[in-house]
Interface confidence: low
């Protein structure tokens, strides 16, 4: 009887062979059958499952001139770049007249050098700080034993001896390279070499040494930097803002910070050109030849109030009999703090100086004692903050009031019976 027509007789005359090889290998499985009549489509099974997207080709050769004669059918399954997922039992399958025929199995196995699933990665670490590196490899054949190398020197005497998938490094003091070797019965594969760059540790104990209205002196303790000396430290200051929300871990301020570099040692820096009576946040990082440390957390600091940098402006002083009317305007120069008020001093040629605290008003009427015959009366005004008095104005002579000159009504201020204090006159 013709092949393929009886249930007990398989049409297959050639079954798939076996392939065993390393990852990436290209190979071909073949099966051959002889059938009578129209050739069937050959399907491939892997571990009993039909391969829907198999890279197979089918060749059909007639053995006679009539379509009903026998045909030789050859199906070739190409495996390109052998992977672990390709391994298993392979068979050909055909449907012939309501009956299914399956070839004898062939086997595809993977056996070669170890294959890395995970390799050590480049990273930066702070000096003397523990970290872990990972390496993972597989066969087949198993087992796969790992051997870690640091700067090309093995960290154990044999594969599988010592740390395996995870290498715990208790700390480094110099930039080092790490790799791992994976060993199995077929040989050795070496991973990529990871460079672990040793950076300085984050500086510690950032603190204020002294404060001036427009400058802050800060100091810090440098962290360890391994065998690499620190080349410099960088300090950043940024204006604080209630809405800014610089938290301990927030990486960057919302505006361009004021950046200063300090040569080291000493681990100290004077930050100038700051605003008085202003909150700032500062942080520091130190750099070696290998790169910069991480920044410290932001430290809130504040410049103190200063005294006003200039005297009150546009002072005028007029006299009418026993009364003197003085008024002025706020200093144009920076106040360096919160203006608390003004001090006024007046003095005649042969009379003691009189000092008065005017408060925040910018005008005052003085009630002069005596008959008003004091000669060469002059007035000075200074603004003050919580930090103290600003510079005094130049002495302004008291001018006689001329009829027609407006003189508003002011609250009279009696001079104190004794001066509040005295300072060297101009």
């Amino acid at each position: 009887a013709p092949r393929g027509t009886q249930a007990e007789e398989s049409p297959f005359v050639g079954n798939p062979g076996n392939i065993t090889g390393a990852r990436g290998l290209t190979g071909t499985l073949r099966c051959q059958l002889q059938v009578q009549g129209e050739p069937p489509e050959v399907h491939w099974l892997r571990d009993g499952q039909i391969l829907e997207l198999a890279d197979s080709t089918q060749t059909q050769v007639p053995l006679g001139e009539d379509e009903q004669d026998d045909w030789i059918v050859v199906s070739q399954l190409r495996i390109t770049s052998l992977q672990l997922s390709d391994t298993g039992q392979y068979q050909c399958l055909v449907f012939l007249g309501h009956q299914t025929f399956v070839s004898q199995p062939g086997y595809v196995g993977l056996e070669g050098l170890p294959y890395f699933l995970e390799e050590p990665e480049d990273r930066t670490v702070a000096a003397n700080t523990p970290f872990n590196l990972s390496c993972q490899a597989q066969g087949p054949p198993e087992p796969v034993d790992l051997l870690w190398l640091q700067d090309a020197v093995p960290l154990a005497t044999a594969p599988g001896h010592g740390p395996q998938r995870s290498l715990h490094v208790p700390g480094l003091n110099k930039t080092s390279s790490f790799s791992c070797e994976a060993h199995n019965a077929k040989g050795v594969t070496t991973s990529r070499t990871a460079t672990i760059t040793v950076l300085p540790q984050q500086p510690r104990n950032l603190h204020l040494v002294s404060r001036q209205p427009t400058e802050l002196e800060v100091a810090w303790t440098p962290g360890l930097s391994g065998i690499y000396p620190l080349t410099h430290c960088t300090l950043q200051a940024v204006l604080s803002d209630d809405g800014m929300g610089i938290q301990a871990g927030e990486p960057d301020p919302p505006e361009e910070p004021l950046t200063s570099q300090a040569s080291v040692p000493p681990h100290q820096l004077r930050l100038g050109s700051l605003h008085p009576h202003t909150p700032y946040h500062i942080r520091v990082a130190c750099t070696s030849s290998q790169g910069p440390s991480s920044w410290t957390h932001w430290l809130p600091v504040e410049t103190p109030e200063g005294v006003p940098l200039g005297p009150p402006e546009n002072i005028s002083a007029t006299r009418n009999g026993s009364q003197a009317f003085v008024h002025w305007q706020e200093p144009r120069a920076p106040l360096q703090g919160t203006l608390l008020g003004y001090r006024l001093a007046y003095q005649g040629q042969d009379t003691p100086e009189v000092l008065m605290d005017i408060g925040l008003r910018q005008e005052v009427t003085l009630e002069l004692q005596g008959d008003g015959s004091v000669s060469n009366l002059t007035v000075c005004v200074a603004a003050y903050t919580a930090a103290g008095d600003g510079p005094w104005s130049l002495p302004v002579p008291l001018e006689a009031w001329r009829p027609g000159q407006a003189q508003p009504v002011h609250q009279l201020v009696k001079e104190p019976s004794t001066p509040a204090f005295s300072w060297p006159w101009w």
Partner: antibody, heavy 117, light 107 residues
């Protein structure tokens, strides 16, 4: 039975050289990493060198690096330690040892090296 | 280098007693510790590796334990033939280093 037998020790002057051998039997020599370990007169154990099973990789601590060379002949199942520029602190009993997967599982009986003028 | 410290140079015990020999590593060696026994006039012999795994043929009165930096070799019932020097060794990092040894004396 695993056997390791060292030979070649003796008295040598400082600056001199000596070559130790370790003949092995009872196991597949080419499958194992091997060591030399020494024991000082004060009974301290110091690891001196190791060699990979194929002989392609050797490693030495700083105390002997550049002066000692370890080698092996897998065809003869023999291990060697060439020692040069010897110092008095190299005086010790020298053992060869086999590395199992995790530790030095078999040691020879040792050969004594004395460096003295 | 990793330093292995055996704080007791000598330990005196009696036959049948339980004795523990300790060893401390200068850093975590993740149980990669071996113990060796050296009897007078003999070469060292491996007792324990990977902190607690007994080598072939080692009597079960010898047990190893520990993790991190602290390791112990315990002899549950000392026999006269256990008179020896005992060394610990780390096989975690090259260079491999040994402890200075503990001499077990039988009263």
């Amino acid at each position: 039975e695993v056997k390791l037998v060292e030979s070649g020790g003796g008295l040598v002057q400082p600056g001199g050289s000596l070559k130790l051998s370790c003949a092995t039997s009872g196991f597949t020599f080419s499958d194992y990493y091997m060591y030399w370990v020494r024991q000082t007169p004060e009974k301290r154990l110091e690891w001196v060198a190791y060699i990979s099973n194929g002989g392609g990789s050797t490693y030495y601590p700083d105390t002997v690096k550049g002066r000692f060379t370890m080698s092996r002949d897998n065809a003869k199942n023999t291990l060697y330690l060439q020692m040069s520029r010897l110092k008095s602190e190299d005086t010790a009993m020298y053992y060869c040892a086999r590395l199992s997967f995790y530790a030095m599982d078999y040691w020879g009986q040792g050969t004594s090296v004395t460096v003295s003028s | 280098d990793i330093v292995m410290t055996q704080s007791h140079k000598f330990m005196s015990t009696s036959v049948g007693d339980r004795v523990s020999i300790t060893c401390k590593a200068s850093q975590d060696v993740t149980t990669a510790v071996a113990w060796y026994q050296q009897k007078p006039g003999q070469s060292p012999k491996l007792l324990i590796y990977w902190a607690s795994t007994r080598h072939t043929g080692v009597p079960d009165r010898f047990t190893g334990s520990g993790s991190g930096t602290d390791y112990t070799l315990t002899i549950s019932s000392v026999q006269a033939e256990d008179l020896a020097l005992y060394y610990c060794q780390q096989h975690y990092r090259i260079p491999f280093t040994f402890g200075s040894g503990t001499k077990l004396e039988i009263k």
